[in-house]
Amino acid sequence: EKLPKAPVITTPLETVDALVEEVATFMCAVESYPQPEISWTRNKILIKLFDTRYSIRENGQLLTILSVEDSDDGIYCCIANNGVGGAVESCGALQVKMKPKITRPPINVKIIEGLKAVLPCTTMGNPKPSVSWIKGDNALRENSRIAVLESGSLRIHNVQKEDAGQYRCVAKNSLGTAYSKLVKLEVEVFARILRAPESHNVTFGSFVTLRCTAIGIPVPTISWIENGNAVSSGSIQESVKDRVIDSRLQLFITKPGLYTCIATNKHGEKFSTAKAAATVSIAEWSKSQKDSQGYCAQYRGEVCDAVLAKDALVFFNTSYRDPEDAQELLIHTAWNELKAVSPLCRPAAEALLCNHLFQECSPGVVPTPMPICREYCLAVKELFCAKEWQAMEGKAHRGLYRSGMHLLPVPECSKLPSMHRDPTACTRLPYLDYKKENITTFPSITSSRPSADIPNLPASTSSFAVSPAYSMT
């Protein structure tokens, strides 16, 4: 009769390299008596026997991943136990290799001379592919204007006529090369403003003349916009000389406003426009002179430029002497505070703050701001910024204000309108477009599963709300 023998792994696991959609096998040869029970883990999480993505054979000694996916990267371990002596373990890594793939190829671009052009070229692959660009038949050389970004996109500052042509991106790693289709960059010379109107700070009831000159072929027409609407009062005088149009708008000032000069000319079936704006503010703007609490205008600041919808009208609160500067200063201060928060919280908090300070605006007899939807506010507070909010509330209770989010002009979620009341009466936050690498785990989430297993919520898992490890009321 055989003597009992503790398990010994005679073939330790090794690092396995595998291409996406190929088969990967780990071998864990074990000698023991009686026959051991062999279990397998990935990143310390048990692989279930009935998981159809895996095949476990040879009494558990052979683990096969039937079709390797990008997300299968990790440390795989076999654990053998037969009740004699202790369990033994051997671990090895799976490195998923992938030929280059262009996931977001460049597209045809028409661009006005002098602007910035970005041709996207997002790639996948392991090892990470290097991206280069070809213009015409030649490799494109980078210079002070032309750069290939970390993402693979091609950025051309201050586009010139000679930048026009056919481009393609090339993604290359040790496993192969991928080419995008040829795309065309067209450089157009459209209407251009030579002299923008100047901002004025005047007394109530003053006359102001705003002047705007523009050039283009054909000669542009100039129109004026006041707080997002066609100018309702004032007189306009125009003159044209040598393809330059000069427009003068004379106004009688009874309220502050944002005045935009729009130069337009036609190219085939398309119109091109150039805009320049000036503010007319009123010195010692008293409450009696206000006909509403604010006005609608395009956001012209910098801090929230990437967060707010392009060309959207936002609400400026005239309880500030200079609403646009005051609100921009508030958000600028908030932005500096956000440097202290986690990468998970920051984009969500930025979206919340920008949309709270610069609320979408419906112009009309009384300009009306559109607050954030309550549910989005709650998701930012309880999901994305749970730790920060917990810390902030703790500091508030103890009278301590050092860092984090305490200075931020944050909304009170419970006072915001719900999407159920009227889905069109509140703003939904665009904080959801997270890049995969930006989220690894939600903080302070109470779950029976290990936090390392909480992913960035891609296809295989889900978040319909959150359970942070503290209570919000």
Partner: antibody, heavy 124, light 107 residues
Framework: EVQLVESGGGLVQPGGSLRLSCAAS????????IHWVRQAPGKGLEWVAS????????SYADSVKGRFTISADTSKNTAYLQMNSLRAEDTAVYYC?????????????????WGQGTLVTVSS | DIQMTQSPSSLSASVGDRVTITCRAS??????VAWYQQKPGKAPKLLIY???SLYSGVPSRFSGSRSGTDFTLTISSLQPEDFATYYC?????????FGQGTKVEIK
Amino acid sequence: EVQLVESGGGLVQPGGSLRLSCAASGFTVSSSSIHWVRQAPGKGLEWVASISSSYGSTSYADSVKGRFTISADTSKNTAYLQMNSLRAEDTAVYYCARSEGDRYVSGYMGMDYWGQGTLVTVSS
Amino acid sequence: DIQMTQSPSSLSASVGDRVTITCRASQSVSSAVAWYQQKPGKAPKLLIYSASSLYSGVPSRFSGSRSGTDFTLTISSLQPEDFATYYCQQSGVWLITFGQGTKVEIK
């Protein structure tokens, strides 16, 4: 008017499969989260699975994980529940329900519209 | 996993009574808690969402509140049509959990 209509229920033997459909009208599946909730005869409500199709994110109750698959076809504005390896304890009325918004906010919205339910009986 | 313990499992009350149903979460949760009413042979109906918000079309005698991990549904003055089974439900990162239900019967 928002409506959810389930179909595909019926009698099936243990180990068998069924595919339930949930046809939505009056809203788009792509901008909502869809949930399957079941109720065994004389018992309470039990959540089965959810999908937020704008992100393709899905989640399942432990009792059905590995056996059931939730999916959505946004072109048909329909959600599905593929049920394999059915057991006697899966016998229930299966409801589909929606909650408004993406996967981050739908939990705050509650399941505001429900279908009439479809009966699944697992028996030999 | 988070459990929602609902109490009582059943209660008898008269028209005009004030009724309170409680759900206790087994650990701290967000305010993503909803309450539903279900009548025999019918699908559940949403009453309260986000712990305390009244769903449109639901009578104002229904209200929801929270205190830490305790969530409460209150019917301020019970009406004949309110006799039904009530469920709480919480939405978490990993799963959705329903309470076991409270049957409100006529005394």
